[in-house]
């Protein structure tokens, strides 16, 4: 199509056109997590701010009860950063009797839930051992990729330890998705 | 709209269409930072290469004086990676008298400046404690997310310690944005 | 163009329009790497799953022999995450005779190959020293940015040590690109 004059009567496209401004989009930011009941054998899900500050949802992309609800089928770019902070982990101590310690770790998972599927699907995982020598440590895990989603799919962010999530600033921990 | 034949007389869109190729876009790459005066109480801003090698700006997205200038309102995906390198940090020493040391850290912030606002807005922050045992350490911090920006907004990348930024290669430290 | 009614006879665009759904896109996921011959003085390239599970290629974006083949010129967002895992590196041992050890490191490079160029171009690099105190360590390196690519360009992901790549789960190690 390079350099070719646009003419409505000679439209070289293979599917209906779509204005970019009306595509489903969301950027959610961290809020303090209140203690809640989590599913057994599943990392706890974070809940999010969806309208204050930098956070927004638009064009039928809705946030409800820890989930982003996908309003139409298509390819989405999905991303999240979670900043963790904690105290020195045990694995940084001198290893006793030559027996190496199992490292502590931090993990973020972006999960897709489809009502017709019994099991959630893990789309993205960032996992890191934490063996810091200093007393207080902090670090982010960033994830982002493109996935084909169906209308009605739900997205959430799960973390290995909800009490280590840095909830202090909206620019440190966030979650978003947009239709490509 | 799936599988439906496109016809100009039956255009199912809700806003004016826009060719993707003319959207504002930029990818900036690292250059060596020379000692300069920084604003008090603010992390120093990096300056960037905007036309050589992999770097480019296009479609009215301009780079000037450490800032990317947003030429039109809309939702932008903004990203940056900064690779830091340094020597062993003090917090990796044996903790004296049981008193834990405050860890050294590295931080990247993507900041938005709006002329009508007195204060810059921090859009994204990646911050990490550095307690390395080896002599030379190096590591990247990556950030990326979507934000609603207004025409005239300016974006910059600030870092906690400008002298630790790895400026040797354009693929290690970079900054970009594109209109969705 | 804000708020203006769309009319085919009054199309305010500067280039031919393009339906989003037919743009080249791919998301590739990790598979176990089989030992192969690598180019001298170049990090080994990973090979990928391109159709099972979360992986897909579409709209003429093809995967073949470790490469993503770019089917049309334009600006692409390219991303990858590689999760590494290994045993304690030597540099975490007590430094003998006051001589600091050279740190081990892990590196990911997204590389572009253009047939008319003799040398590959490194688009993105994430590199990190590894000086872990615990016995087993694991951590991801994430990269993503926008580049102007030409039809026929080929993309690959190279890593410093293929034997340290975590190939166990498709959400831990992945590679993707999409036309903007």
């Amino acid at each position: 199509l390079k350099g070719q004059e646009f003419a409505p009567s000679h439209q070289q496209v293979y599917a209906p056109l779509r204005a970019d401004g009306d595509k489903p989009r969301a950027h959610l930011t961290v809020v303090r997590q209140t203690p809640t009941q989590h599913f057994k054998n599943q990392f706890p899900a974070l809940h999010w701010e969806h309208e204050l500050g930098l956070a927004f949802t638009k064009n039928r992309m809705n946030y409800t009860n820890k989930f982003l609800l996908i309003p139409e089928s298509g390819d989405y770019f999905i991303y999240s950063q979670v900043t963790f902070r904690g105290m020195t982990s045990e694995c940084s101590e001198i290893r006793q009797a030559g027996r190496p310690n199992k490292p502590d770790s931090i993990t973020v998972v972006i999960t897709k839930v489809t009502d017709s599927y019994p099991e959630p699907t893990q789309l993205l995982m960032g996992t890191k051992s934490v063996c810091e020598v200093g007393s207080n440590w902090f670090q982010p895990i960033y994830l982002g990729a493109m996935f084909s989603l169906q209308e009605g799919d739900k997205l959430m962010v799960n973390v290995s330890d909800i009490s280590l999530v840095d909830y202090t600033k909206e620019d440190k921990t966030f979650f978003g998705a947009f239709l490509l | 709209l799936k599988g439906q034949e496109f016809a100009p007389s039956h255009q199912q869109v809700y806003a004016p269409l826009r060719a993707d190729g003319d959207k504002p876009r930029a990818h900036l790459t690292v250059v060596r930072q020379t000692p300069t005066q920084h604003f008090k109480n603010q992390f120093p801003a990096l300056h960037w290469e905007h036309e050589l090698g992999l770097a480019f700006t296009k479609n009215r997205m301009n780079y000037t004086n450490k800032f990317l200038l947003i030429p039109e309102s809309g939702d932008y995906f903004i990203y940056s990676q900064v690779t830091f390198r340094g020597m062993t940090s003090e917090c990796s020493e044996i903790r004296q008298a049981g008193r834990p040391n405050k860890p050294d850290s590295i931080t990247v912030v993507i900041t938005k400046v709006t002329d009508s606002y007195p204060e810059p807005t921090q859009l994204l922050m990646g911050t990490k404690s550095v307690c390395e045992v080896g002599s030379n350490w190096f590591q990247p911090i990556y950030l990326g997310a979507m934000f609603s920006l207004q025409e005239g907004d300016k974006l910059m990348v600030n870092v906690s310690d400008i002298s630790l930024v790895d400026y040797t290669k354009e693929d290690k430290t970079f900054f970009g944005a594109f209109l969705l | 163009l804000k708020g203006q009614e769309f009319a085919p006879s009054h199309q305010q665009v500067y280039a031919p329009l393009r339906a989003d759904g037919d743009k080249p896109r791919a998301h590739l996921t990790v598979v176990r790497q089989t030992p192969t011959q690598h180019f001298k003085n170049q990090f080994p390239a990973l090979h990928w799953e391109h159709e099972l599970g979360l992986a897909f290629t579409k709209n003429r974006m093809n995967y073949t022999n470790k490469f993503l083949l770019i089917p049309e010129s334009g600006d692409y967002f390219i991303y990858s995450q590689v999760t590494f895992r290994g045993m304690t590196s030597e540099c975490s041992e007590i430094r003998q005779a006051g001589r600091p050890n050279k740190p081990d490191s892990i590196t990911v490079v997204i590389t572009k190959v253009t047939d008319s160029y003799p040398e590959p171009t490194q688009l993105l690099m994430g590199t990190k020293s590894v000086c872990e105190v615990g016995s087993n360590w694991f951590q991801p390196i994430y990269l993503g940015a926008m580049f102007s690519l030409q039809e026929g360009d080929k993309l690959m992901v190279n890593v410093s040590d293929i034997s340290l790549v975590d190939y166990t789960k498709e959400d831990k190690t992945f590679f993707g690109a999409f036309l903007l």
């Epitope: - | 020379t34 000692p35 340094g86 020597m87 003090e90 030379n136 630790l164 | 600091p100």
Partner: antibody, heavy 118, light 107 residues
């Protein structure tokens, strides 16, 4: 513009100490590492060490360990290098230098000649 | 410590000549290699960083290349003001070390 202005020439006896100052202007003093490099007459360049003006942290070359002390006064944007137990081998021009990154030297002072002679 | 060697130690050339100076590190220093120019009685001047990237304000007749252990500094067409001593310096790890220098003289 960025400038480093060093103190004047010194003549010292063996066994004495010398303290050279380096006043910085035109940039944020605490944001960039300050290095000290010396050059004996007719010889090459020898890195002595650095100070991080923000934290006061230092890194000295092994051959100067125990003899050199680098300090700074952020209120007057000045770095200092003190070398003790001087011998005739320490006769040299001493430069302060600042880098945009910690591993290189963008801007140099004019140099301070230190002569050690009995 | 990383040792830096330079060759030649001195070099005679004429205005307009192309000259090349080599620098070798005793172990890999990646691209953390800098070049300086020094004239008699003056402080060194920073020329090239990251092995191949020209410092702002340095004429384009200067160029650098190399990675790992072997590096070169080239001057494409010598000008009268280029006659000086050139030093390489590794910034990979401390102690930072300089090469012994190459003295470029007028033939």
């Amino acid at each position: 513009q960025v400038q480093l202005v060093q103190s004047g020439a010194e003549v010292k006896e063996p066994g004495a100490s010398v303290k050279v100052s380096c006043k910085a202007s035109g940039y944020t003093f605490t944001a960039y590492y300050m290095h000290w490099v010396r050059q004996a007459p007719g010889q090459g360049l020898e890195w002595m060490g650095w100070i991080n003006p923000k934290s006061g942290g230092t890194n000295y070359a092994q051959q100067f360990q125990g003899r050199v002390t680098m300090t700074r006064d952020t209120s007057i944007s000045t770095a200092y290098m003190e070398l003790s137990r001087l011998t005739s081998d320490d006769t040299a021009v001493y430069y302060c230098a600042v880098g945009g990154s910690y591993d290189a030297f963008d801007i140099w002072g004019q140099g301070t000649m230190v002569t050690v002679s009995s | 410590d990383i040792q830096m060697t330079q060759s030649p130690s001195s070099l005679s050339a004429s205005v307009g000549d192309r000259v090349t100076i080599t620098c070798r590190a005793s172990q890999s220093i990646s691209s953390y290699l800098n070049w300086y120019q020094q004239k008699p009685g003056k402080a060194p001047k920073f020329l090239i960083y990251g092995a191949s990237r020209l410092q702002s304000g340095v004429p384009s007749r200067f160029s650098g290349s190399g990675s790992g252990t072997d590096f070169t500094l080239s001057i494409s067409s010598l000008q009268p003001e280029d006659f000086a001593t050139y030093y390489c310096q590794q910034g990979h790890s401390t102690p930072f070390t300089f090469g012994p220098g190459t003295k470029l003289e007028i033939k």
